[in-house]
C-alpha cells in the first residue's frame, strides 16, 4: 500500500479558510473558488489494499477530508 | 482511456496568428483544470497558461501574457490557446496538460499537471 | 518567479545503477515539487508529486525526497527503458516553473 502525500505545511494557510462556506482556498493562486461539487457525498475510507491515492474521481466522489485527516484525491478543478 | 490529443500546429508568419486545439476524452473534462505548457527546440519546458475548470479564472505565463488567450468548450471537451502577434520565440513544441489537485480540509493542492497530449509543433518563420 | 536548478545536466549510467538528480528551488516551496520523465518526441510524464508521492502506475525503482528548497530524485535501480530526460517543477505559485532538465545517457 502507498501512502498518500504528507500534509504540506509550506504555506500554512490558517484553519478555518478565509473563504465563504461554499468556496475551497486554492494554495497555488492563494484565492478562494467554488468547491461546492467537491465535498457530498462522503467517500468510503480507502482499504489497506487500495490503488495508489492518485485516481481522476468525479465531483461527487470527491469530497474533501476534515481538518487534519489525509488528502483525498479530487479533479483539478481550477 | 484518459486522453489528450492535440491539432492545429503549423508553420505561421511573425506577426499572425493561430489557434491550437486539445481534445479530451476518458475523463470528466469539465471538472478538472488545464494548462498548456511549451518547449521550444533543445529548450527547458516552460508553462504557458492555466484556465480553470469552468474557464472563470485564467493565468498567464508573462511572455505570452496580452497575446495569447487560453479558453475551453466543456460541451465540446475541447481546451483552446488562441495565439495572436506571433514571435519568432514561440517556436516550440506546445502541450496540453491536466491540473492534478488534492484537496485536503477546505484547502486546495496542486500537484503537477498528470495527463499531457501528445504535442503540437508551431514554427514561426518569415 | 521561483527558480528552479538541477543538477547534474547529464549524466552516464549503465543498467542496474543507482541514479540521483537534484533539484534546487530559489526559495522555499515545502514539498510542492513534481517530477517528470521525458523521451525524445514524446511528451513529459509525471512521475513523483508532492516531492515524495509515486505516480499512480510509476515503478517503485523511482522515489523522491527533500522539502523546503533542496529535493532529490533517486532510481535505485536503472532499467534501459529509464534512459530518458528528467525535469523538476514547482506547483507552490504562478508562474509554475521547470528545471531545464537532467539527461541520462547509457555509459
Known amino acids: 500500500m502507498r501512502r498518500g502525500p504528507r500534509s504540506l505545511r509550506g504555506r500554512d494557510a490558517p484553519a478555518p479558510t478565509p473563504c465563504v462556506p461554499a468556496e475551497c482556498f486554492d494554495l497555488l493562486v492563494r484565492h478562494c473558488v467554488a468547491c461546492g461539487l467537491l465535498r457530498t457525498p462522503r467517500p468510503k475510507p480507502a482499504g489497506a489494499s487500495s490503488p495508489a491515492p492518485r485516481t481522476a474521481l468525479q465531483p461527487q466522489e470527491s469530497v474533501g477530508a476534515g481538518a487534519g485527516e489525509a488528502a483525498l484525491p479530487l479533479p483539478g478543478l481550477l | 482511456e484518459v486522453q489528450l490529443v492535440q491539432s492545429g500546429g503549423g508553420v505561421v508568419q511573425p506577426g499572425r496568428s493561430l489557434r491550437l486545439s486539445c481534445a479530451a476524452s476518458g475523463f470528466t473534462f469539465s471538472s478538472y483544470g488545464m494548462h498548456w505548457v511549451r518547449q521550444a527546440p533543445g529548450k527547458c519546458l516552460e508553462w504557458v497558461a492555466v484556465i480553470w475548470y469552468d474557464a472563470s479564472n485564467k493565468y498567464y505565463g508573462d511572455s505570452v501574457k496580452g497575446r495569447f488567450t487560453i479558453s475551453r468548450d466543456n460541451s465540446k471537451n475541447t481546451l483552446y490557446l488562441q495565439m495572436n502577434s506571433l514571435r519568432d520565440e514561440d517556436t516550440a513544441v506546445y502541450y496540453c496538460?491536466?491540473?492534478?489537485?488534492?484537496?485536503?480540509?477546505?484547502?486546495?493542492?496542486?500537484?503537477?499537471?498528470?495527463?499531457w497530449g501528445q504535442g503540437t509543433t508551431v514554427t514561426v518563420s518569415s | 518567479e521561483i527558480v528552479l536548478t538541477q543538477s547534474p545536466s547529464s549524466l552516464s549510467a549503465s543498467v542496474g545503477d543507482r541514479v540521483t538528480i537534484t533539484c534546487r528551488a530559489s526559495q522555499s516551496i515545502s514539498s510542492y515539487l513534481n517530477w517528470y520523465q521525458q523521451k525524445p518526441g514524446k511528451a513529459p510524464k509525471l512521475l513523483i508529486y508532492?516531492?515524495?508521492s509515486l505516480q499512480s502506475g510509476v515503478p517503485s525503482r523511482f522515489s523522491g525526497s527533500g522539502s523546503g528548497t533542496d529535493f532529490t530524485l533517486t532510481i535505485s535501480s536503472l532499467q534501459p527503458e529509464d534512459f530518458a530526460t528528467y525535469y523538476c517543477q514547482q506547483s507552490y505559485s504562478i508562474p509554475l516553473t521547470f528545471g531545464c532538465g537532467t539527461k541520462v545517457e547509457i555509459k
Open positions: 496538460a491536466r491540473r492534478f489537485t488534492h484537496l485536503r480540509g477546505w484547502y486546495i493542492e496542486d500537484y503537477g499537471l498528470d495527463v
Open positions: 508532492a516531492a515524495s
